[in-house]
Interface confidence: low
């Protein structure tokens, strides 16, 4: 439905508060280096303009597209060339090329200072002094560090952030109340950002068809009682929402997400029995709740899949008449019967089925050719099952920190060219799969583990894409979205790698390590471990363990010493010498 003024339409639909928040997120995700005050000024200008359009949709410029209006506004930033370099060239382009240009310059790893949390009293004072600015700063800081963060979901996080401060700044023990809530929001936020980044990568690198296939599989698992027609409608709508958000169309995205939540709740009887509680919540909570809702129970007595997809003589006819619909139906039927499979496994099975039909429907005897297609699924199912079993056993044996270390060693040997901070970040996240998923019963382990690993490996892919250093990473990241994890799993030690020169400075530590949090201390040790492997890729597990144990003892000893700095200097030299000897460096 065409509107005379798109900006007026969105302002009226979303309301002023959400409109301003979403424009701020959009601008911060595009111009990640701009100061907060500059963004607030731009947002206020856009908001005032939107209000004139609400008053009179025929007013000058009100008929312009949102991309034109927002792009024009961003291109008024005086320091664009000096701050962003070639991104300033985007402003010479016309829409839609200009927006595409801005999108291409989004930086997954912007050079921004780490967010350091102030003292609780300082935060509470700032919150009370100017609540609106305090919350805007939260949106701004998250959005610029996570340029693909799902904007309507960020509004939900901001609402929880506000609630935490409202409650805890009045509490007797402010810190005890607030800090756990902020930790939870931080961890959930990072996870949400990474999940959305995979959705955007799926759409941008592999296309709408790949995203729709993912959505059919996931929604069919979640809503197994819904008809295929219903699932197809939800998939179409969900694809539109994510295409918009990933494309920077945040106002349209938030508006359409609200419409989708409304539709789902109005039709919950035909979708899922698990939606009742979600649908009683306010909009932001409702949308979040729906996105996280547990799988509904599978309908009783679902017939065998073989009848329609193997035994029927109409398989090739149905396939030929509407390939994607037929494959979509296959995926829907398989997924609703298998909540115990990961989405990526279901997509591999669908791909195998498609490949078989492509070959067999051109054969002399198609039915004879595809009759055993389900047998081809067995090894595809067993591979992730076995891998998860082995890794959960290792996790239970080692605990999270040491399990992360095992993965650090494993991945550094596979792709030693990747930067140490990226290897540490990705391997730490890969290692979290243990505590996240191994506690689950067998039926929930695979969807938890393999779909989580897809999210983490996508982090590796987007970080590597910015500065490509390894052909092996590029190959695994670009060849097949659903086979990324098996591709990385199959990588052996990179025999072509020339070990890094030994640099004592890398292994020199100071007393400041003693004041770090446990997490930060772990990262320091894990950084050293990656560097060790880069120097000595052929080091055995035993050698590396011995060095790391010595290192842990060294840190513990010097942190207890009276003269910590002297201890680190003297004992550090001894440790480096001993480590070199142990590893034959």
């Amino acid at each position: 439905d065409a509107h005379k003024s798109e900006v007026a339409h969105r302002f009226k639909d979303l309301g002023e508060e959400n409109f301003k928040a979403l424009v701020l997120i959009a601008f911060a995700q595009y111009l990640q280096q701009c100061p907060f005050e500059d963004h607030v000024k731009l947002v206020n200008e856009v908001t005032e303009f939107a209000k004139t359009c609400v008053a009179d949709e025929s007013a000058e410029n009100c008929d312009k597209s949102l991309h034109t209006l927002f792009g024009d506004k961003l291109c008024t930033v005086a320091t664009l060339r000096e701050t962003y370099g070639e991104m300033a060239d985007c402003c010479a382009k016309q829409e839609p090329e200009r927006n595409e240009c801005f999108l291409q310059h989004k930086d997954d790893n912007p050079n921004l200072p780490r967010l350091v949390r102030p003292e609780v009293d300082v935060m509470c004072t700032a919150f009370h002094d100017n609540e609106e600015t305090f919350l805007k700063k939260y949106l701004y800081e998250i959005a610029r560090r996570h340029p693909y963060f799902y904007a309507p979901e960020l509004l939900f996080f901001a609402k929880r952030y506000k609630a935490a401060f409202t409650e805890c700044c009045q509490a007797a023990d402010k810190a005890a109340c607030l800090l756990p809530k902020l930790d939870e929001l931080r961890d959930e936020g990072k996870a949400s950002s990474a999940k959305q980044r995979l959705k955007c990568a799926s759409l941008q690198k592999f296309g709408e068809r790949a995203f729709k296939a993912w959505a059919v599989a996931r929604l069919s698992q979640r809503f197994p009682k819904a008809e295929f027609a219903e699932v197809s409608k939800l998939v179409t709508d969900l694809t539109k929402v994510h295409t918009e958000c990933c494309h920077g169309d945040l106002l349209e995205c938030a508006d359409d997400r609200a419409d989708l939540a409304k539709y789902i709740c109005e039709n919950q009887d035909s979708i899922s029995s698990k939606l009742k509680e979600c649908c009683e919540k306010p909009l932001l909570e409702k949308s979040h709740c729906i996105a996280e809702v547990e799988n509904d129970e599978m309908p009783a007595d679902l017939p065998s899949l073989a009848a329609d997809f193997v035994e029927s003589k109409d398989v090739c006819k149905n396939y030929a008449e509407a390939k994607d619909v037929f494959l979509g139906m296959f995926l829907y039927e398989y997924a609703r019967r298998h909540p115990d499979y990961s989405v990526v496994l279901l997509l591999r099975l669908a791909k195998t089925y498609e490949t078989t039909l492509e070959k067999c429907c051109a054969a002399a005897d198609p039915h004879e050719c595809y009759a055993k297609v389900f047998d081809e699924f067995k090894p595809l199912v067993e591979e992730p099952q076995n891998l998860i079993k082995q890794n959960c056993e290792l996790f239970e044996q080692l605990g999270e920190y040491k399990f992360q270390n095992a993965l650090l060693v494993r991945y550094t040997k596979k792709v030693p060219q990747v930067s140490t901070p990226t290897l540490v970040e990705v391997s730490r996240n890969l290692g979290k799969v243990g505590s996240k998923c191994c506690k689950h019963p067998e039926a929930k382990r695979m969807p938890c583990a393999e779909d989580y690993l897809s999210v983490v490996l996508n982090q590796l892919c987007v970080l590597h894409e910015k500065t490509p250093v390894s052909d092996r990473v590029t190959k695994c990241c670009t060849e097949s979205l659903v086979n990324r994890r098996p591709c990385f799993s199959a990588l052996e030690v990179d025999e072509t790698y020339v070990p890094k020169e030994f640099n004592a400075e890398t292994f020199t530590f100071h007393a400041d390590i003693c004041t770090l949090s446990e997490k930060e201390r772990q990262i320091k040790k894990q950084t050293a471990l990656v560097e060790l492997v880069k120097h000595k890729p052929k080091a055995t597990k035993e050698q590396l363990k011995a060095v790391m144990d010595d290192f842990a003892a060294f840190v513990e000893k010097c942190c207890k010493a009276d003269d910590k700095e002297t201890c680190f200097a003297e004992e550090g030299k001894k440790l480096v010498a001993a480590s070199q000897a142990a590893l034959g460096l």
């Epitope: 008809e227 027609a229 197809s232 017939p303 329609d308 037929f326």
Partner: nanobody, 124 residues
């Protein structure tokens, strides 16, 4: 192979009502989208109404909205078309159709199985 047999056609005066039935055999009826199409003499076959597997979604041509109602009884393997306020332009051969895999309910090429048709004549 699904067989479809329509019944309930006949001659009726303008403003009158008829109820068409379509009995299915030879397949799992509840897994099929069912549709009604019609073809008037000298004209192309056109979509009338369709119903999804569990009766959750129903679709109607604009020309019959508010007058015709499609329904199904999966326990009886039957789909119905209740036609009220009939007009002379509703005169046609009415076909029942079944589709296992469909993306567009209104497109006849999406339907795999067809009945022989039952004639409806609206005349004074």
């Amino acid at each position: 192979e699904v067989q479809l047999v329509e019944s309930g056609g006949g001659v009726v005066q303008p403003g009158g009502s008829l109820r068409l039935s379509c009995a299915a055999s030879g397949g799992t009826f509840s897994t099929y989208v069912m549709g009604w199409f019609r073809q008037a003499p000298g004209k192309e076959r056109e979509f009338v109404a369709a119903i999804s597997q569990n009766s959750i979604h129903t679709y109607y041509a604009d020309s019959v909205k508010g007058r015709f109602t499609i329904s199904r009884d999966n326990s009886k393997n039957t789909v119905y078309l209740q036609m009220n306020s009939l007009r002379p332009e509703d005169t046609a051969l009415y076909y029942c159709a079944a589709s296992r895999f469909t993306s567009w309910y209104t497109a006849d090429y999406e339907y795999d199985y067809w009945g022989q048709g039952t004639l409806v004549t609206v005349s004074s």
